[in-house]
Every structure is written in C-alpha cells, then in structure tokens.
Interface confidence: low
C-alpha cells in the first residue's frame, strides 16, 4: 500500500504566446486538476478505467479572465493531489493530468466545466524515490509538475511489497516510527516459493509467489504479452527459443481489469488493482468519491462500496469514464457524400456540389419543387434530374418549343410534317415505313409484310415521337 503524490507547480501559456481557449468565459473562473493513473506502459484503450486510482484537486482561487489574454500564470489550487494505492506499486504506469476551468456563471445544470489541457505520459517510477519533475506542453499551455510514489508503512521497497516490521518491540520506542526503511531494521521478508522471480515476483506469506503487473506464471517469469510464445503448449518451443510453461490456472490471465494472477494449489488468486475486487477483479469498487469521470462527466451512484458508479458523459464523450471522445462523424451524419467536420461544439457538413442543408439532405438537382413546363415529367437519376418533355417541347425544363422535324427524321427524301401526336413522314416513291426507312423491292414485294389496306407506298406514315418501332 502507498500513495502517489502529484504537485502542480504552475499552469500557464507556454513559450511563444497566449493560448486561446475554445470556450469564452463570461464570468469568474477557477482552476482544478484531475489525475488518473493506469497500470502499464502500453497504450491502453482510452476508455479503460483509472485502475490505479484517480483524484480531483480542490478548486483554485477565483480569477477573472482578461478579454485579451489569460494571466501569465493562472492561480492554482493548494495542496497535493494524492492517489492512494492498496496493492503493489506497478513501477510502470500511465499518468494523465487534466486541467479544468470552472465557470461560475449562471448556467443550467451547475457551473460549466471546460477542459483547458490534458497531458498523458507513460512513466517508470520506483516507489520510495525522490520527486520526479516534469514540464509538459498541451497545445499552447505549459504544465509544470512533480510526482512521486511513496509506500505507507509497514510496506517498503520499490513496489511497496516488502513488509517492514520491527524485530522486537524494544527496538522502537514510544512515538517513533515502527522501523526505518533499512533492511537490517526490518523483519526479514518472508521466504518466497523457490525460484520465484526476484525481479517480477514477491510474496507476503512464506512459500507463495505473487506477480507484479505484466508478469504471470507460477514463478512470475512469463510476461503477459502478445509475444510469439503465447498460444504454444508444451515445455518449450524450439522454434522461438521461448520457455513456455504447460497449462496452468493462470494461463490467459483470468484476472480482469489489470489484476495479476498467482497460482495456488489447484487454483489461482487475483491481486486486484485499486478500485476492483472479486474472484477475478471483475467487480468495480471505485466510487464517485474517487472522481472517476473525466471530461466533465457527472458521476452517479457508487454511494457505497458495493454499488457501481456510472459516469454521465457530456455530449462528445463516451466510455465508462467519459475518457473517449466520440467520433461523431463515424455515425455518418452527412448525407449524399458530404464531408463531416467535428468542430467539437458542433458538427458541420461540407456538401458536394448539388446538395445543401445542415446534413446535405437537400438535393438541389432533384425533382422536389422542380416542375417541368408544358406537361413534361421529371425523372431523377444520379444526383441530377432531367425532364422528359411532352411532344413539341424540349430543353432542360421543357420551356423551349421543339420542332420534331428539325432532326430530319424521314429517310430517303421523305417529307416531314409535324403532327399533334408526333411527326408524319410522307415517303418518296419506292420507300415505306414510319421513317421511310424500308425500300419497296422492284418485283413489287416489300421487305416487310404487306401494308394494311388503304395505306399505299408513298402515303404519309404516322410516327409518334416517343415510339421507336414502325407501325403498319
């Protein structure tokens, strides 16, 4: 057990100019900070819980933003941010620090929170070491801070896993610390299981071997990773040169939420990170008092240790801790191939040519509200529209008077006559058909069936404009 401590030294514009907040504060403001600790150095899913713990600072002094630029250094809350940890300190961890501004204006739902800066660092840190200083940039802001992890007696060591007890009561007088963190002042640590890794294992009871974060196996020799060794079975793999243990109760690490697995006779035991408990660390014990909700999320529930908390996330954020920014464009709100732009405070759609509206839902080229003149009918297709015009009219909107004979449709010298139902071809001698396209053979036999009674070669042939077949 121990405590992670974070001291914020300053927060203000970094070298090169005053940052402009995306929000405009209309009244007095104050700063506060949130810290989130996650185990391991790997890039965790953004919405993964702050399994090592989280803490919220007090509010800082009230200040009023200048209309032109923020103060060079904004007033900070007093005191350390402290995140207690119950189990072993993992040594490798992710540190997330958020700087928040609370607007004290008159908004529905309480003071408005806006995130000014967020820094995420992956760090190695031994417990009991000195303060580690850091300067981080977040956009145009600069954050200066120090941090350390310290064990709480009787735990000592770089992982706070060795228990330090006085060898005899006479060694420690009244009012003195139980013992100094020196090996010879402490009770000898328990003898672990033979072969238990000195680097990755520890024990609190004789004969056991419990693994630090990221290690598994009966002797804590096997890294929890996606290495080529995993998935193989048998005593070893000659192809990879990896030592692969046989099947064991900790294979595949049954402990959820960053818990580490230790084998026990015929079973396993999970050492759960702070905030989780249960046989497999599957039950969350984090409460709202731990400040688990990020990005202005509202924590509801968790009033007692057995009830799970729920983070109500503000628009634009999701995940169990409101840590994941919603890609609102993934919902594809822009129609008709529009380009989606998430501006944070709003979504915008950049529409393709021919489309308009907040979501590009209006097709400027469609038939809606587009009348085709002179009895024409509108036909949609391919994001555009066209008018199928009534006889005698043409053009985009059927507003132009068309001459059906203009295209000289009658073949072989036939004469064209415009007609209310189409056009009529008067064929030259020796030709017949709707467009005079068929020659009459010299022997008097047509290439087509005989003309109906009363229709002789050379008579005008009626040809409705919209048909493509001849009529006899």
């Amino acid at each position: 057990a121990g405590v992670f401590e974070l001291q914020i030294h300053s927060f203000g514009p970094g070298p090169g100019g005053a940052p402009r907040s995306p929000y405009s504060a209309r009244g007095p403001c104050r700063l506060f900070f949130r810290v989130c600790l996650k185990p391991g150095l790997s890039e965790e899913a953004a919405e993964s819980p702050c399994a090592l713990g989280a803490a919220l600072s007090a509010r800082g002094p009230v200040y009023t933003e200048q209309p032109e630029a923020p103060a060079p250094d904004l007033p900070l809350p007093n005191g350390l941010l402290q995140v207690p940890f119950r189990d072993a300190w993992p040594g490798t961890f992710s540190l997330i620090i958020e700087t928040w501004r609370e607007e004290l204006g008159d908004q529905i739902g309480g003071p408005a929170w806006s995130l000014l800066a967020r820094v995420t660092r992956r760090r190695r840190l031994a417990a009991g070491g000195p303060w580690a200083g850091d300067i981080q940039r977040a956009g145009a802001w600069e954050l200066r801070f120090s941090y350390r992890a310290r064990c709480e007696l009787p735990a000592v060591g770089t992982a706070c896993t060795r228990l330090c007890r006085p060898r005899s009561a006479s060694r420690c007088g009244p009012g003195l610390r139980p013992c100094a963190p020196l090996e010879d002042e402490c009770e000898a640590p328990p003898v672990c299981r033979a072969g238990c890794s000195l680097e990755h294992g520890f024990c609190e009871q004789p004969g056991e071997c419990r693994c630090l974060e990221g290690w598994t196996g009966p002797l804590c020799m096997v890294p929890v990773s996606t290495s080529s060794c995993l998935g193989l079975r048998g005593p070893s793999s000659t192809t990879t040169g990896c030592l692969v243990p046989g099947p064991g109760p900790c294979d595949g690490n049954p402990c959820a939420n960053g818990g580490s697995c230790s084998e026990t006779p015929g079973s396993f035991e999970c050492t759960c990170p702070r905030g989780f408990y249960g046989l497999r660390c599957e039950v969350s014990g984090v409460t709202c008092a731990d400040g688990p909700c990020f990005n202005g999320g509202l924590c509801v529930g968790g009033a007692d240790p057995d009830s799970a908390y729920i983070c109500h996330c503000p628009p634009g954020f999701q995940g169990s801790n409101c840590e994941k920014r919603v890609d609102r464009c993934s919902l594809q709100p822009c129609r008709n191939g529009g380009l989606c732009l998430d501006l944070g405070h709003a979504l915008r759609c950049r529409c393709r040519a021919g489309f308009a509206g907040p979501r590009c839902e209006h097709d400027l080229n469609d038939c809606a509200g587009r009348a085709c003149a002179n009895g024409g009918t509108c036909v949609e297709g391919g994001g555009a529209h066209r008018c199928s015009c009534a006889l005698g009219f043409g053009g985009r909107d059927c507003r132009e008077r068309a001459d059906p004979c203009a295209a000289r449709p009658c073949a072989h010298g036939g004469r064209c006559y415009a007609h209310f139902s189409g056009l009529v071809c008067a064929c030259a001698p020796g030709y017949m058909g709707a467009r005079c396209e068929f020659p009459v053979h010299p022997d008097g036999v047509s290439a087509l069936p005989a003309a109906p009674p009363g229709l002789r070669p050379g008579d005008p042939q009626r040809y409705p404009h919209h048909h493509h077949h001849h009529h006899h």
Epitope: Q107, I108, G109, G110, P111, A112, W113, C288, G296, L298, V300, G301, G302, A303, I310, H312, C313, P314, P315, Q318, V326, R328, L331, P333, L347
Partner: antibody, heavy 118, light 108 residues
C-alpha cells in the same frame, strides 16, 4: 425553440408492452441526453430512464428489467418500451431533455396519458 | 436510493406572502445536485432551480433555492397568483434519479 412531442397508444392491455415515441424538434438529438418520466394520476414524479445518442442508457432499477429506451437519430426520435404492464403503470408519461452539465430536466413534452386496462 | 421527503404536504398562503418549502434527503447529496420544479394542473413540470441555488433561464428572482448536504429549501419571497401550484425537488447525485413527493401551494 426546442420542442418535444410524445406519441403512442393511450390504452394498453395488461401484460402487453407500452410503446411511446418522443419526437424532438428545434435542436439536434445528438447534443443532449433524453429521458422519460412518469406521473401516476394524483401522485408524484418517477424517473424511468435516459438515453444518449452514443448508446449510453440507464434506467430506474425498480423498472429496469421491463424498460427499453432507444433512439433514432435519423428521425430525431427516442422511444420507451415498457413490457408486462399492469394497472400500476397507468400514468402520464413525459419525455424530457437532460441538460448536459447536470441531470436536471430543463425541457419537457406536454405528456401523454396511458391507461392500462383490459 | 436517495429518498427525498418534502414538507409540508400542503401550504395554504395568500398572494404576497412568503412561501418556504423543504426537501430533506435520506443521505447526503454531494455537489448540491438538487433541482426544483413547478407543476400546474394539466401541465408538464417546469425547471425552476438547479444546483440547489441557481435559477433556470427565465425564472423570476422571487424564486430562490438554498441548502446543502441533506437539507434544501425553496423560497418564494412574495407569492404571485401564478405561483400557486405543486413543487417537486429532484436529486441528480445518485442513480436512480429521484423526486420528492411534492408540496402543494394553495390559495388560503
């Protein structure tokens, strides 16, 4: 001006499922949480459940096994399904908007009366 | 769940008088996550106060809220004829979100 309008049958038979829809106009349904609240005749208000467009939902444990809240962003609507209804579910059902910095309900529909009776 | 108890159940007053409505929580409400609503017969509730003491948009300044922890108060400094209605408190600190049983302010 944001407006909410509840719709659905006013009479439901016992053991059947009550289905109501709330249509949101005047703002994007993606910008807020949305909730259902009910009020039995002559009695107080009871929170039923809420939904956010990302899929986040929560409902009152006293009703949880019977409640489904869903949302359709394309129609700008969210819905309530309450299964296995009894006469005790007779109430005026309200849909409301949840302001995004605190779970107070700042805009309400006018309410729709649902009677459970055979 | 947090149980909210409102008192009195009915308050009989005359226009111009001061009304004091109480809402007591069964457990501490952190961050003053408490709201007050007004409801007139046949109408939906209307948000008056959020965060225990902040007036919602368009609410006259004769309405004020106060309190923290487990005891909260809604005060109407000078009753107008349109203020005679039912009033409900609601906590949004702990799930499930709960309402009080209501106080009816009626004309004496």
């Amino acid at each position: 001006q944001v407006q909410l309008q509840e719709s659905g049958p006013g009479l439901v038979k016992p053991s059947e499922t009550l289905s109501l829809t709330c249509t949101v106009s005047g703002d994007s349904i993606s910008n807020y949480y949305w909730t259902w609240i009910r009020q039995p005749p002559g009695k107080g208000l009871e929170w039923i459940g809420y939904i956010y467009y990302s899929g986040t939902t929560n409902s009152n444990p006293s009703l949880k096994s019977r409640v489904t809240v869903s949302l359709d962003t394309s129609k700008s609507q969210f819905s309530l399904n309450l299964s296995s209804v009894t006469a005790a579910d007779t109430a005026v059902y309200y849909c409301a908007r949840v302001f995004n910095r605190g779970f107070a309900f700042d805009i309400w529909g006018q309410g729709t009366m649902v009677t459970v009776s055979s | 769940e947090i149980v909210l108890t409102q008192s009195p159940g009915t308050l009989s007053l005359s226009p111009g008088e001061r009304a004091t409505l109480s809402c007591r929580a069964s457990q501490r409400i952190s961050n003053t996550y408490l709201a007050w609503y007004q409801q007139k017969p046949g109408q939906a509730p209307r948000l008056l106060i959020y965060g225990a003491s902040s007036r919602a948009t368009g609410i006259p300044d004769r309405f004020s809220g106060s309190g923290s922890g487990t005891d909260f108060t809604l005060t109407i400094s000078r009753l107008e004829p349109e203020d005679f209605a039912a009033y409900y408190c609601q906590q949004y600190d702990t799930s499930p979100l709960t309402f009080g049983g209501g106080t009816k302010v009626e004309i004496k």
